[in-house]
Amino acid sequence: FERTRSLQDPCSNCPAGTFCDNNRNQICSPCPPNSFSSAGGQRTCDICRQCKGVFRTRKECSSTSNAECDCTPGFHCLGAGCSMCEQDCKQGQELTKKGCKDCCFGTFNDQKRGICRPWTNCSLDGKSVLVNGTKERDVVCGPSPADLSPGASSVTPPAPAREPGHSPQ
């Protein structure tokens, strides 16, 4: 089948990193500088992405694969493929239109990005607060008050800090 396809379409023999050059009797020519082809049989090479300014090059462009950008230090990527860069804040802060602001009481942010989120309400799970929350950390829920009464046979180990649901980037 491969041989039949090759007879029908000479371009199918051109490997990644080359293109089928119509101007040169359909021979396989290398991709020009700053371009690539990641699959065989391509009639053109794609322009490489350029990482400039707030973007920096995470992976250089090669003849067979595109460049990849990330953000310069102090910034983090937004969007698939890092299409935008947003300023980092400190843990215990969130980015607002007026810059990085501390989390309000009762909320926390344990990352350099994203928004402040409410502390876990331990009582909703019938538990008590074992460790108080801070701007940087969620509360740690412990055993329920009933479990701590005299004569209780066992103590439930503290539950790990619950990560509130957030959509992946």
């Epitope: 300014g53 707030v54 953000c71 698939a80 299409s83 935008m84």
Partner: antibody, heavy 115, light 107 residues
Framework: QVQLQESGPGLVKPSQTLSLTCTVS????????VHWIRQHPGKGLEWIGA???????DYNAAFISRVTISVDTSKNQFSLKLSSVTAADTAVYYC?????????WGQGTLVTVSS | EIVLTQSPGTLSLSPGERATLSCKAS??????VSWYQQKPGQAPRLLIY???NRYTGIPDRFSGSGSGTDFTLTISRLEPEDFAVYYC?????????FGQGTRLEIK
């Protein structure tokens, strides 16, 4: 609050140099760069060039022989100089912060080239 | 340079209707396309970045899609304040370029 404001003479004579400044607040000039973009009356947007946070520049090849973008961190200002202007350079000129997608723009300033 | 071609040039619709704006790139630009809204006397306003990501504070009636060379901005239900000029722009390769714009007007 992030703010950018363009300023400069609204009227420039042909063959002279157009000089604009972009005064910024709410962010550091050593952290962010700035792009200059222009828009001819009733037309689309045209990227002129950019200065990056480290001070290096990139220019559109269409302007490269007559454009200079610079920064004065002590004044919180970026500047654009475009020499040998003609009537075709009449446009609204914008500066926009470099974040990868132009989320923050100045309000723009109209420059008319006429004798 | 990468050329972006927007269509239609003008779109006449009524409030409540759905608007579909197209942007075609002369080269593969991945998903590195943004959409902007511009009203008379104002600077462009970022709506969508990375082809499909709504920017902070943009209503969810605005959505973007596409990759490679074909991109679409959709406004699901037009509000009176949505009538404006819309531009696509590519941030993939320098020089950065923009489409010529689509004017969305009230029918």
């Amino acid at each position: 609050q992030v703010q950018l404001q363009e300023s400069g003479p609204g009227l420039v004579k042909p063959s002279q140099t157009l000089s604009l400044t972009c005064t910024v607040s709410g962010f550091s000039l050593t952290t962010y760069g700035v792009h200059w973009i222009r828009q001819h009356p009733g037309k689309g947007l045209e990227w002129i060039g950019a200065i990056w946070s480290g001070g290096s520049t990139d220019y559109n090849a269409a302007f490269i022989s007559r454009v200079t973008i610079s920064v004065d961190t002590s004044k919180n200002q970026f500047s654009l100089k475009l020499s040998s202007v003609t009537a075709a350079d009449t446009a609204v000129y914008y500066c926009a912060r470099d974040d990868g997608s132009f989320a923050n723009w100045g309000q723009g300033t109209l420059v008319t080239v006429s004798s | 340079e990468i050329v972006l071609t927007q269509s239609p040039g003008t779109l006449s619709l009524s409030p409540g209707e759905r608007a579909t704006l197209s942007c075609k790139a002369s080269e593969n630009v991945g998903t590195y396309v943004s959409w902007y809204q511009q009203k008379p006397g104002q600077a462009p306003r970022l709506l969508i970045y990375g082809a499909s990501n709504r920017y902070t504070g943009i209503p969810d009636r605005f959505s973007g899609s596409g990759s490679g060379t074909d991109f679409t901005l959709t406004i699901s239900r037009l509000e009176p304040e949505d009538f404006a000029v819309y531009y696509c722009g590519q941030t993939y390769s320098y020089p950065l370029t923009f489409g010529q714009g689509t004017r969305l007007e009230i029918k």
